[in-house]
């Protein structure tokens, strides 16, 4: 018995070949012997039953001369899953058609971090098929009648080519995923005290009609609890602020991409924030973490100090050096100082290996006098 796979709504071609490779009389029937269609010697396709009943069934007249008499079933339905019989040259060929339906839960448009379940349904009691989906960038996910893709990323968006294999027979179908998310899961901004701070939250997708609301919660390093800094609404590309804290006095861009400006970096603002965006008609929220590290260099009496506040990695090195000279002091700590610094331009550096994250300069005029 030959097996043919078909996806609901698409077409399937059931094969029937003559041994003599020439036109001959043939008939396609259901397993209960009801006639579907055939050719009785005049080269004319004869349909069984009423036209409306069999309008989805056809054959390839162009292939008859070569001894091929396929049964084409269009707009496949789940109930088409059954055995079909081709009668020709005093023999019967049985062809088993397995029609499957693909469902995507919760859908093919998802938020970053969500999971997708792809399910194959069928009327027939077939043994477990192999389902495999491959992204154009090479990622492969496989399963049987159920295929799961968890913790989806923005880069999982786009076209996936899927194959269903059963008894070495294959059927292809495609799915286009749209995973909505921010371009970066997290970002870190390094600023000297007093500098203006800009936070950007670009989305990694473009949707013409985008409706939702968002909020930025901030956990300052110096504070015991987090605080809502700003809430906003989003409609298409239009951003409107609903509520903003008085300290700091944030400003938000009125159109996408989401963008916030903090007038100046101060030690009390150093810390980390979480921007959440809830989109209409989507369960769950999008998140982006943002971190602010603030540096201050000061000279008080005979002490030159450099401090950083905010979430720094243990690998980061803080150094104080006189310009064009070796570092006077370097530590994996958040504060370094030099007693009785000599006159000149001093540099405070925050670095990760040989990569300088930020630097602040302070002019020491003479012992105990400074100018930043």
């Amino acid at each position: 018995k030959t097996l043919v796979l078909g996806k609901e709504g698409e077409s399937a071609e059931l094969p029937c070949e003559s041994s003599q490779k020439k036109i001959t009389v043939f008939t396609w029937k259901f397993s209960d012997q009801r006639k579907i269609l055939g050719q009785h010697g005049k080269g004319v396709l004869i349909r069984g039953g009423s036209p409306s009943q069999f309008d989805r069934f056809d054959s390839k007249k162009g292939a008859w001369e070569k001894g091929s008499f396929p049964l084409i079933i269009n707009k496949l339905k789940m109930e088409d899953s059954q055995t079909y019989i081709c009668e020709l040259e005093n023999r019967k060929e049985e062809v088993e058609l397995w029609v499957f339906k693909v469902t995507f839960s919760p859908g093919t448009s998802l938020l970053q971090g969500q999971s997708l379940t792809l399910t194959l349904d069928s009327n027939s009691k077939v043994s477990n098929p192999l389902t495999e989906c491959k992204h154009k960038k090479g990622k492969v996910v496989s399963g049987s009648k159920v295929l799961s893709m968890s913790n989806l990323r923005v880069q999982d968006s786009d076209f996936w080519n899927c194959t269903v294999t059963l008894d070495q027979k294959k059927n292809w179908f495609g799915m286009t995923l749209s995973v909505l998310g921010f371009q970066k899961a997290s970002s870190i901004v390094y600023k000297k005290e007093g500098e203006q701070v800009e936070f950007s939250f670009p989305l990694a997708f473009t949707v013409e009609k985008l409706t939702g609301s968002g909020e930025l919660w901030w956990q300052a390093e110096r504070a015991s609890s987090s605080k809502s800094w700003i809430t906003f609404d989003l409609k298409n590309k239009e951003v409107s602020v609903k509520r903003v804290t008085q300290d700091p006095k944030l400003q938000m861009g009125k159109k996408l991409p989401l963008h916030l400006t903090l007038p100046q970096a101060l030690p009390q603002y150093a810390g980390s924030g979480n921007l959440t965006l809830a989109l209409e008609a989507k369960t769950g929220k999008l998140h982006q973490e943002v971190n602010l590290v603030v540096m201050r260099a000061t000279q008080l009496q005979k002490n030159l100090t450099c401090e950083v506040w905010g979430p720094t990695s243990p690998k980061l090195m803080l150094s104080l050096k006189l310009e064009n000279k070796e570092a006077k002091v370097s530590k994996r700590e958040k504060a370094v100082w030099v007693l009785n610094p000599e006159a000149g331009m001093w540099q405070c550096l925050l670095s990760d290996g040989d990569k300088v994250k930020m630097d602040s300069r302070i002019q020491v005029l003479s012992r105990g006098v400074n100018q930043t």
């Epitope: 203006q196 800009e198 409609k235 590309k237 239009e238 400003q251 861009g253 400006t261 007038p263």
Partner: antibody, heavy 118, light 107 residues
Framework: EVQLLESGGGLVQPGGSLRLSCSAS????????MSWVRQAPGKGLDWVSS????????YHADSVKGRFTISRDNSKNTLYLQMSSLRDEDTAVYYC???????????WGKGTTVTVSS | AIQMTQSPSSLSASVGDRVTITCRAS??????LGWYQQKPGKAPKFLIS???SLQSGVPSRFSGSGYGTDFTLTISSLQPEDFATYYC?????????FGQGTKVEIK
């Protein structure tokens, strides 16, 4: 063709009120942000107020807050500016402007003149 | 509110000259900046959006650049019809604010 036509300007005494209208045609009025911008004689452009078509949110310059109210009637394709407690410094040509899809004022009316004087 | 400082306030130039007008924002506004041209007794005309994107129908001798706080409008070869007043507008946030204008006059 997109067209904006302002009306309602005139002479008014300090402390008085006036309502400006802007009739729009040639585009789907309800989809766009609409604004009022003014220009005092011999001076530069001064943004007054904006209203979103999508959300209905309104925004006003500090100098007119509490005195001027922007509104719109999408069924009539008309933008309004209700001005009260008028001052000498409100004397200007008032332009109606339409935002484009990127939220820039791309099309402007010819303006209507408001004179506040006793 | 964000302040927009335009310079120079006026300039005299001849036909064929290259003219540059600058606009500085009191805080970062990304590239959310527009440029407008206004002739006496007329409504402003929209020239450039997003700091550098020329509007359709605007001659290619006009160009814009900048990001953050510093922006420039350049007219590569001044034509007689370009004598007018030019305004920058920050469109980053409300309240929208214009520069005070630059009047380009015939030398």
């Amino acid at each position: 063709e997109v067209q904006l036509l302002e009306s309602g300007g005139g002479l008014v005494q300090p402390g008085g009120s006036l309502r400006l209208s802007c009739s729009a045609s040639g585009f789907t009025f309800s989809d766009y942000v609409m604004s009022w911008v003014r220009q005092a004689p011999g001076k530069g452009l001064d943004w007054v107020s904006s209203i979103s078509g999508l959300t209905g949110n309104t925004y006003h310059a500090d100098s007119v807050k509490g005195r001027f109210t922007i509104s719109r009637d999408n069924s009539k394709n008309t933008l309004y500016l209700q001005m009260s407690s008028l001052r000498d410094e409100d004397t200007a040509v008032y332009y109606c402007a339409k935002d484009n899809e990127d939220y820039y004022m791309d099309v402007w009316g010819k303006g209507t003149t408001v004179t506040v004087s006793s | 509110a964000i302040q927009m400082t335009q310079s120079p306030s006026s300039l005299s130039a001849s036909v064929g000259d290259r003219v540059t007008i600058t606009c500085r924002a009191s805080q970062g506004i990304r590239n959310d900046l527009g440029w407008y041209q206004q002739k006496p007794g007329k409504a402003p005309k929209f020239l450039i959006s997003a700091a550098s994107s020329l509007q359709s129908g605007v001659p290619s001798r006009f160009s814009g650049s900048g990001y953050g706080t510093d922006f420039t409008l350049t007219i590569s070869s001044l034509q007689p019809e370009d004598f007018a007043t030019y305004y920058c507008l920050q469109d980053y946030t409300y309240p929208r604010t214009f520069g005070q204008g630059t009047k380009v006059e015939i030398k």
